[in-house]
């Protein structure tokens, strides 16, 4: 029961996280104009990964897409790539994890297969979360660097009477959404990996034949070994010792009244 809950919760947390990563990637407010000494502004600038926007005090908003690919900073391209990789991995992870869910039964899928799928999706979620966190952090670092550079420029090179006020940008809402979403996806992935451990059967190697000593002495009969070995028609042991090939997880794969998980 705990394994199912862990897996289900991991799935839900990852789903929320990936939705957040998608939202953050699409958001325009990755960087917003720093209002340092002017809390009310007539023209407010903010930028996303795909376009930059200007909102006037009247409410008028104008957004312009970055219609160039080669002219964009390499860092921005890297952030875009990281976020897209995060989304793609997350989406694949979600798809895989749906089939891996213990509560969803598809044909006669074995628990070992579900465990592997759970682990795969978990790893995908972890990498997806890390990609998002890395992307957001790279962008944040870029902002911090540019912020201090523009601050330095504001107080130097003013030569004449005319001031050119450089627009400084600070962290936008998308960064916080991205960090939280990345963290959630990461946590979801870890939960899926933990759930995988519970799903995976404890592999007991039954390939070595187990001989039970019979209660009475057995005379050697050249005709065969049916008398007391475990290979005969001993129905009591058949399920476990059927050729030494079947393991416990196969036993579990048939629903029975003892199948609580």
């Amino acid at each position: 029961m705990a394994v199912t809950a862990c897996q289900g919760l991991g799935f839900v947390v990852s789903l929320i996280g990936i939705a957040g990563i998608i939202a953050a990637t699409c958001m325009d407010q990755w960087s917003t104009q720093d209002l340092y000494n002017n809390p009310v502004t007539a023209v407010f600038n903010y930028q996303g990964l795909w376009r930059s926007c200007v909102r006037e005090s009247s409410g008028f908003t104008e957004c312009r897409g970055y219609f160039t690919l080669l002219g964009l900073p390499a860092m921005l391209q890297a952030v875009r790539a990281l976020m897209i990789v995060g989304i793609v991995l997350g989406a694949i992870g979600l798809l895989v994890s749906i089939f891996a869910l213990k509560c969803i039964r598809i044909g006669s899928m074995e628990d070992s297969a579900k465990a592997n799928m759970t682990l795969t999706s978990g790893i995908m979620f972890i990498v997806s979360g890390l990609c998002a966190i890395a992307g957001v952090s790279v962008f944040a670092n870029m902002l911090v660097t540019n912020f201090w550079m523009s601050t330095a420029n504001m107080y130097t090179g003013m030569g004449g009477m005319v001031q050119t006020v450089q627009t400084r940008y600070t962290f936008g809402a998308a960064l916080f959404v991205g960090w939280v979403a990345g963290g959630l996806t990461l946590i979801g992935g870890v939960m899926m990996c933990i759930a995988c451990r519970g799903l995976a059967p404890e592999e007991t190697n039954y390939k070595a034949v187990s001989y039970h000593a019979s209660g009475h002495s057995v005379a050697y009969k050249p005709g065969g070994f049916k008398a007391s070995t475990g290979f005969g028609s001993n129905t009591k042991n058949k399920k476990i010792y059927d050729g030494g090939a079947r393991t416990e997880d196969e036993v579990q794969s048939y629903p029975s009244k003892h199948d609580y998980v």
Partner: antibody
């Protein structure tokens, strides 16, 4: 047809206060900012402040803080500017104007209200 | 606050002439976000409220005759009236519409001979 109708001329005593009104018609009052401008004889235009009638948010020129108070009544589509502790320096024509959607420019103006402070 | 300086303070021309008036701002009015200059021109005829002529430095308001042209960027702006008409007798104001508080130039008074 957008129209901003301002209240009539006022002659007031020094130290008192006056409330100038600006009734808007022909557009959605809460969707546009209303700005107030002061014009003294022989001088240029002076920006007093702005109000967002939709959420009653205001922004004042530092020079007019404590002097002017901007309010708006959504039900009557009317913006108000109250001037307090009047002195002769406050004698001027006051205009209300609507901010156009784009450019932060004032596209429609009231006819102006003359305020004369005299003892 | 941004200081707006207009020149000349007045000018007298004959009808049909081309007129240019200047407006300078103490800070750049160019917004990097949309590459637009937040400078507005108004015309105020005697006994009337001002009317909007040009916004974003060179975008004419609807209904404004095309003889009115705005130009310039950053801190230096110009209003040009091609072939001045008698009805253009007015005071012309430039305004910073980039940052609060909005500030106006002292105006250029246009007189017709």
């Amino acid at each position: 047809q957008v129209h901003l109708q301002q209240s009539g001329a006022e002659v007031v005593r020094p130290g008192t206060s006056v409330k100038v009104s600006c009734k808007a018609s022909g557009y959605a009052f809460t969707n546009y900012l209303i700005e107030w401008i002061k014009k003294r004889p022989g001088q240029g235009l002076e920006w007093v402040g702005v109000i967002n009638p939709g959420r009653s948010g205001t922004n004042y020129n530092e020079k007019f803080k404590g002097k002017a108070t901007l309010t708006a009544d959504k039900s009557s589509s009317t913006a108000y500017m109250q001037l307090s502790s009047l002195t002769s320096d406050d004698s001027a024509v006051y205009f209300c104007a609507r901010t156009r959607y784009g450019g932060n420019a004032m596209d429609y103006w009231g006819q102006g209200t003359s305020v004369t402070v005299s003892s | 606050d941004i200081v707006m300086t207009q020149s000349p303070s007045s000018l007298t021309v004959t009808a049909g002439e081309k007129v240019t008036m200047s407006c300078k701002s103490s800070q750049s009015l160019l917004n990097s976000g949309n590459q637009k200059n937040y400078l507005t021109w108004y015309q105020q005829k005697p006994g009337q409220p001002p009317t909007l002529l040009i916004f974003w430095a060179f975008t004419r308001e609807s209904g404004v005759p095309d003889r009115f042209t705005g130009s310039g960027s950053g801190t230096d702006f110009t209003l040009t009236i091609n072939s001045v008409q008698a009805e253009d007798l007015a005071v012309y104001y430039c305004q910073n519409s980039y940052s609060y508080p909005f500030t106006f130039g002292s105006g250029t008074k246009l007189e017709i001979k």
